[in-house]
């Protein structure tokens, strides 16, 4: 071409009929006004769709790709059952790379760039009414969802998109359910629904299996009051429309078949691509024609760069720009009402929100007020945690029924059968076994059932856990563990146990008004004041005792021989008299052994000079040994008091921690995360960390057992066990003070009774009459004055 | 071929209350639509009163609503509407029409009646 | 309530003349209006629903155009049964209202 001469750039398309090639040609001649470029002149080189694939990937290779096309616009064949005519199209103009634009196709597979490599559209597919769908959830509450879906490419791409929209908003579906696509019965599957809590039926199917599922809902009932259908665009065409229930919302893609402006549309991005793309250095030609050629168009991929970072803001239908899989993004929807057999527009989606227009929605059941979304399911699943006298746990009787007891009033023990792991202990295997349960908390729940006309079925936690958010193998990813988790994932409706209430759980959970105010104390041994039989050695130290007992009988020895042997030792008067007898050995000891321990001794004294003068000294010694000694002993008397209890929280023992006292608490409980968190108890934590026990039970007979020095865990729970053991006593002020609340989940339909419910028990005395039933009994005496005993252990 | 045909007092007096009838040829009321009350003061604007849905349901202009009653009679194929406490502003020419709520617009009305409010 | 504003009020204009007119709503309508003629001692007829599609008998010299809260009717080719009195009527919200009216006369 001349130096002067505009740059021919081609654009092909493949189109429905031959007003759609004109409306093409009209549309490049408008994008040629439009930028007004000496430099690039557009061209148009069209054809209308073929029969099938192969007559169709051969037009594309001789009529389109032998003119050099940049970019080849595709509509959607006008035949409905002749779903996958762009494939061709999409195939042969992708493996040269040639960017190929769809104009009205939906279908989700074209998103797989695996597959459509070059692929872009100015529609979205069908699974981002998942987008829709989820907006009109939020807007109406609606937090309860069965997801229907056809198990196919369609049904799992607008799965998968909705529930990872779900996730971000830390919900799911209660349930999803997925039929394979042309089965004639879905009845087992809509039963199974039924049988649910959620109302919210989302339906992503064909035509033809949407049909079957609304003839089948409608035989079930299911398309009655209470119930919402919320469905996509094909849902409520042509078969399916004929059987849709009254009622049903779905939607409708504005101008989603309006193939002259989506022609438009699409001939506007390519043209400013176009423009974009010549700007650019070292651009190839597109190749000519797919005879001997195996070549890609090496531009082709940064052209389809260049594309899919358009943004055409003045399209016939709206902004157009595309997403990292190259469908379009913000898509306007028109939310339509199917009324006494007619769809009326009742709402919108503008790409980003739905906006209703409530006043011309009718519901199903020709209901005018929003349905709730979920039904009262009145059996629940209530999950709970081994936790004296909250919750006490014993076996069954051999014919699975609960022994009979009877409660401190007299009154029989209320018992329920509930389900859980028959050990905790770590390492034995576990067995899911049916056991009894009682105590605070069944009482609870029995008055709750009884008031509020539900039935229940009480399991224990399996992890035996309160809950703590732990990290997923190592990841940034957060999971609840206990009965927080099972809350969470639907695996119990409510958590009835000493569960204590605080900000971390309550962002996830909805708790109800307190049933049980208390606050975290410190369990410790008692320690009764008593000395032992060898108490009266302490005075002395055992060398002194030594000593002493080597001197009574060195000294007894020296008086026998100086008494013996001592020539001063006898003298007569008169020779008549009978001469006295030396000391004997025994009797010199009978005197060491007296003048020490103080007995007066009448006779067997040393009568030699020497021999009295070590007696006189050996006197002087002993009587400096005793007094010591008695002085010695009252102080160790008076002195002999257990070491001072824990003061409380700010002890200076559990301040500043060491191994010679170790305190802990229960492993992912709200206690563990309450040190974890409070940075001024770091230092604490830290030492707790390392002693941690996995259970309440299990910490408190290390206490007994002299293992654990302290026990920091909830007032009630350890002022009933110190009332129960005599040998432990709780000590110090409360601290973080709190209370014991009934779990269930944000969206759960029974929490506002529930509160009502435990404040109505508050004003009636039930609380009351529970904790004097439960807590607050007392099988110790708690006077401790008693004096200093002497015992033999 | 749907007719609609408005009937009733051409003279009300003040404070009293307007009573006027639609009789629907054509096609059944219970059927489908919503069927509406329109109004239109001489030389002015239309103003929209109040409709009643083929399953009964009806609503009302928040404007009139504490005085205006909209009812039907399926036996006769008829809705009507009872505007309470009128005063000279009432004065206007009151159409029936036919809402396709599938459309969002009024297909069928009819001819209209003139009622004037005085003494 | 939504307030739907028409103008002209009143326009002159001849035979064959192409003629706009245009209704803005105080709020987003998102396309649910309908335009009407009334000729003088009549009931209003529909001429266009859902902003852009002609009721049945209507002459395709009308069309109607527009989304949000601007909306067009145009005839392209005015004759002499059109000179009337056009309101737009949005159907969105509760009340659904009325434009105050275009007169359109001979000039």
């Known amino acids: 071409r001349a130096a002067c001469d505009p740059k021919i750039v081609n654009i092909g398309a493949v189109l429905s009929t031959r007003k759609h090639e004109q409306m093409f040609r009209e549309a490049v001649n408008q994008a040629n006004k439009r930028h007004g470029s000496w430099k690039i002149q557009l061209n148009a080189t069209s054809v209308t769709h073929k029969p099938n694939a192969i007559q169709m990937a051969l037009s594309v290779c001789e009529d389109l790709i032998s003119s050099q096309v940049y970019a080849i616009l595709v509509s959607h064949p006008p035949t409905p059952n002749d779903h996958f005519t762009p494939t061709p199209v999409s195939y042969t103009a992708g493996f040269y790379r040639i960017p190929v634009l769809g104009l009205t196709t939906r279908m989700s597979i074209y998103s797989d760039k695996s597959i459509h490599l070059s692929f872009l559209r100015t529609v979205p597919p069908y699974s981002h009414q998942s987008s829709v769908w989820f907006e009109m959830m939020r807007v109406y509450s609606w937090n309860h969802i069965i997801l229907l879906v056809s198990d196919d490419h369609e049904g799992r791409a607008a799965q998968k998109r909705l529930e990872t929209l779900l996730e971000e908003r830390e919900s799911k579906a209660e349930k999803v359910l997925q039929f394979d696509p042309g089965t004639k019965n879905v009845t087992a599957l809509l039963m199974e629904a039924k049988e649910l809590e959620a109302r919210v039926i989302i339906l992503s199917a064909s035509e033809d299996d949407a049909a079957t599922v609304y003839r089948a809902a409608a035989m079930l009932n299911m398309t009655g009051s209470g119930y919402v259908w919320l469905v996509g665009e094909r849902e409520i065409s042509g078969n399916a429309l004929r059987y849709a229930p009254d009622g049903i919302l779905g939607l409708q893609l504005i101008n989603g078949k309006n193939e002259s402006a989506h022609i438009s549309d699409a001939v506007g991005v390519v043209a400013q691509a176009v423009h974009e793309l010549l700007e650019k250095e070292n651009i190839t030609d597109p190749p000519r024609g797919c005879v001997g050629n195996t070549n890609i168009w090496k531009t082709g991929p940064l052209f389809k760069r260049v594309l899919m970072s358009s943004k055409y803001a003045d399209g016939v239908t709206g902004r157009v720009e595309f997403n990292e899989d190259g469908d379009r993004k913000f898509a306007n929807y028109s939310i339509m009402n199917l009324q006494n057999r007619k769809l009326v527009q009742v709402g919108i989606y503008n790409g980003t929100h739905v906006i209703p227009n409530d006043r011309k929605i009718i519901w199903p059941g020709g209901e005018t007020e929003k349905p709730r979304g979920y039904q009262m399911s009145t059996r629940l699943k209530i999950v709970t945690i081994h936790q004296e006298p909250f919750v006490y746990v014993k076996p069954t009787l051999s014919d699975g029924t609960c022994k009979e007891e009877f409660t401190v009033n007299g009154d029989p023990v209320k018992k329920v059968i509930c389900t859980g792991p028959n050990d905790t202990s770590p390492g034995s295997p576990r067995h899911t076994v049916p056991q009894c349960c009682y105590g605070f908390c069944i009482d609870l729940l029995i008055k709750l059932a009884r008031t509020m006309n539900f039935t229940y079925e009480v399991h224990l936690v399996a992890d035996g856990k309160f809950g703590t958010q732990e990290r997923v193998n190592n990841s940034n990813k957060k999971e609840w563990n206990g009965m927080m988790g099972e809350l969470l994932s639907g695996q119990a409706d409510m958590i009835v146990a000493p569960l204590t209430i605080n900000n971390e759980r309550a962002q996830y959970i909805e708790f109800s008004k307190p049933f049980k105010y208390q606050g975290l104390t410190i369990l410790v041994k008692k320690e009764i004041p008593r000395s032992t039989l060898d108490s009266f050695m302490q005075p002395f130290q055992s060398t002194l005792w030594l000593l002493v007992g080597l001197s009574v009988h060195v000294v007894a020895v020296m008086l026998y021989l100086l008494d013996r042997f001592s020539p001063f030792g006898r003298f007569k008067v008169n020779s008549e008299e009978e001469e006295e007898d030396a000391l004997t050995l025994s009797s010199a000891m009978w005197f060491s052994w007296g003048v020490l321990l103080n007995s007066g001794i009448g006779e067997g004294a040393p009568r030699s000079f020497s021999a009295r003068i070590l007696g006189m000294v050996w006197a002087g010694f002993a009587m400096i040994i005793v007094a010591s000694y008695t002085a010695n002993l009252a102080a160790f008397l008076v002195l002999d008091r257990p070491e001072e209890r824990i003061t409380g929280i700010n002890d200076p023992r559990l301040r500043n921690p060491s191994d010679k006292f170790i305190y802990a608490t229960v492993k992912q409980s709200s206690v563990d995360i309450y040190f974890r968190r409070q940075v001024e108890l770091s230092t604490m934590y830290r030492h707790m960390e390392k002693h941690n026990y996995e259970s309440a039970a299990e910490a408190i007979q290390a206490v007994r057992d002299n293992k654990l020095h302290a026990f920091i865990w909830d007032s009630a729970v350890l002022e009933f066990e110190a009332s129960q053991k005599c040998d432990l006593v709780t000590t110090g002020e409360l601290f973080f003070r709190s209370g014991f609340g009934i779990g269930m989940r944000k969206d759960s339909p029974w929490k506002q009774n529930v509160s009502l419910s435990i404040l109505k028990s508050h004003e009636n005395g039930f609380m009351e009459d529970l904790d004097k039933t439960w807590v607050r009994y007392q099988e110790c005496d708690s006077r401790s004055n008693a004096p200093a005993t002497l015992t033999f252990e | 071929q749907v007719q609609l045909q408005e009937s009733g007092p051409g003279l009300v007096k003040p404070s009293e209350t307007l009573s006027l009838t639609c009789s629907v040829t054509?096609?059944?009321?219970?059927?489908?639509?919503?069927w509406h009350w329109i109004r239109q003061p001489p030389g002015k604007g239309l103003e929209w009163i109040a409709y009643?849905?083929?399953?009964?349901?009806?609503d009302y202009n928040p404007s009139l609503k504490n005085r205006v009653t909209i009812s039907r009679d399926t036996s006769k194929n008829q809705f009507s509407l009872k505007l309470s406490s009128v005063t000279a502003a009432d004065t206007a020419v009151y159409y029936c029409?036919?809402?396709?709520?599938?459309?969002?617009?009024?297909?069928?009305w009819g001819q209209g009646t003139l009622v004037t409010v005085s003494s | 309530d939504i307030q739907m504003t028409q103008s002209p009020s009143s326009l002159s204009a001849s035979v064959g003349d192409r003629v706009t007119i245009t209704c803005r709503a105080s709020e987003n309508i998102y396309s649910n209006l309908a335009w009407y003629q009334q000729k003088p001692g009549k009931a209003p007829k529909l001429l266009v629903y859902a902003a852009t599609n002609l009721a049945d008998g209507v002459p395709s010299r009308f069309s109607g155009s527009g989304s949000g809260t601007d909306y067009t009717l145009t005839i392209s080719s005015l004759q002499p049964e059109d000179f009337a009195t056009y309101y737009c009527q949005h159907f969105w919200d509760s009340p659904p209202t009325f434009g105050q009216g275009t007169k359109v006369e001979i000039k």
């Open positions: 054509g096609y059944s009321i219970t059927s489908d639509y919503y």
């Open positions: 029409a036919r809402e396709d709520y599938g459309s969002s617009s009024f297909d069928y």
């Open positions: 009643i849905r083929y399953d009964g349901r009806n």
